[in-house]
Amino acid sequence: FNLSYPITPWRFKLSCMPPNSTYDYFLLPAGLSKNTSNSNGHYETAVEPKFNSSGTHFSNLSKTTFHCCFRSEQDRNCSLCADNIEGKTFVSTVNSLVFQQIDANWNIQCWLKGDLKLFICYVESLFKNLFRNYNYKVHLLYVLPEVLEDSPLVPQKGSFQMVHCNCSVHECCECLVPVPTAKLNDTLLMCLKITSGGVIFQSPLMSVQPINMVKPDPPLGLHMEITDDGNLKISWSSPPLVPFPLQYQVKYSENSTTVIREADKIVSATSLLVDSILPGSSYEVQVRGKRLDGPGIWSDWSTPRVFTTQDVIYFPPK
């Protein structure tokens, strides 16, 4: 698609521009900038208005149109998501006096749930003061190819559906897109509309293949045991309903009276052997999963389990 922005597990900068302002647009893929990584494996999108030093300021603008775009060095154009009403864009003439600072940021994280039915986007406000004072609403517009007819690559005007995002908890909105099983391999086109205090921010058109954005449920049944040869065997079960093999990341810490040791291993089996274990030590273990043979998103970590070895380990076991 040349009219939509492909979502990949990166962190993006989404810049929002009022009229007659010069802009520095930039894209921050993971690894190119400090603080771009995300410990739980999700990509993040930040929405940040950045103005030049000509004195343009939110509080000086009585009516402002905000165009929000992802920007890359290769593509200076921005595809705005078409409104279903007469094909207008979702950029509005708004009253922006409510903004006293130029600092409106959002983190956006999306994935397909492990049961392969719901595509979820979380939109978190990083501009806490504004959104405490002004309730904000988030809608997600999306389109999947029609089941009943051949669909062109670019959606026709008015073909989007809209979901009302649930913004009831922790200054974070949850948008749920139902994905029929038959469409898991199709391309989902979507855009976000964020409204607060009369100001509307509109993301560009984004595209994603849901099957490539699966976030599995955490692995199940994590347990530990000492093997006959004195190693610690960590085992777990794959979560249900995932239609492809997973890789697993196991992190564990060993806490004994003499040493604290931490380790992190990637495996494709549903078990891991830890050797050189110490008597009288405790091992805290967590595991998470991700698609093995293609793109995907790491699951949440499983609930931590703690295993304490006996003060004396017998070979062979008593």
Partner: antibody, heavy 119, light 108 residues
Framework: QVQLVESGGGVVQPGKSLRLSCVAS????????MYWVRQAPGKGLEWVAV????????YYEDSVKGRFTISRDNSQNTLDLQMNSLRVDDTAVYFC????????????WGRGTLVTVSS | DIQMTQSPSSLSASVGDRVTITCRAS??????LNWYQQKPGKAPKLLIY???SLQSGVPSRFSGSGSGTDFTLTISSLQPEDFATYYC??????????FGQGTRLEIK
């Protein structure tokens, strides 16, 4: 046989509570989102609440938010609607209905159960 | 929320007549419109989904058309069992779903 059967309706005073149930049979209940829809006497259809297939997501029509709770037990194939602080304008026939996930239409309905709120 | 307005509110017709019921949305809803039939004391029954797709088991005399804001349900040749109330429902803006106020089809 594919069907939905509601129960639990009756006459209740304003401010009181009532719990409606809907038993599903003949299809894989745990795979489907479910709606409660109501119809006041002589009036049209109005959605009340929806719960997604896994029970983790619920949404409510504005007038029932904070008073009604939709829930489900996939092991028992049951859908419930707990109605608290009932008002006279909640008087209606309440239908449970199965949602088609592809096009968001209601393709299977129960026969309904009548709730009358009256002093 | 999206408002759905049906017209007429009621209409009288005879067996064999061709009948058209219209439904208008307060904003464009593409083809995300469904039609239901309800008989007195019964639950609604799905007739048409996605504006023009006939639900399995529904007679072919029922058809739907339209896109955007204006939609029609047509019964090509009325049968005695077709006298009922008909509702449209938008599935564009979800999870709230909104119905039209209904069109009552009576025997002339």
């Amino acid at each position: 046989q594919v069907q939905l059967v509601e129960s639990g309706g009756g006459v209740v005073q304003p401010g009181k509570s009532l719990r409606l149930s809907c038993v599903a049979s003949g299809f894989t209940f745990s795979s489907d989102a479910m709606y409660w829809v109501r119809q006041a006497p002589g009036k049209g259809l109005e959605w009340v609440a929806v719960i997604y297939y896994d029970g983790n997501y619920q949404y409510y029509e504005d007038s029932v938010k904070g008073r009604f709770t939709i829930s489900r037990d996939n092991s028992q194939n049951t859908l419930d609607l707990q109605m608290n602080s009932l008002r006279v304008d909640d008087t209606a026939v309440y239908f449970c209905a199965r949602l088609n996930w592809d096009y968001w239409y209601l393709d299977l309905w129960g026969r309904g159960t009548l709730v009358t709120v009256s002093s | 929320d999206i408002q759905m307005t049906q017209s007429p509110s009621s209409l009288s017709a005879s067996v064999g007549d061709r009948v058209t019921i219209t439904c208008r949305a307060s904003q464009s809803i593409s083809s995300y419109l469904n039609w239901y039939q309800q008989k007195p004391g019964k639950a609604p029954k799905l007739l048409i989904y996605a504006a023009s797709s006939l639900q399995s088991g529904v007679p072919s005399r029922f058809s739907g058309s339209g896109s955007g804001t204006d939609f029609t349900l047509t019964i090509s040749s009325l049968q005695p069992e077709d006298f009922a109330t008909y509702y449209c429902q938008q599935s564009y803006s979800t999870p709230p779903i909104t119905f039209g106020q209904g069109t009552r089809l009576e025997i002339k």
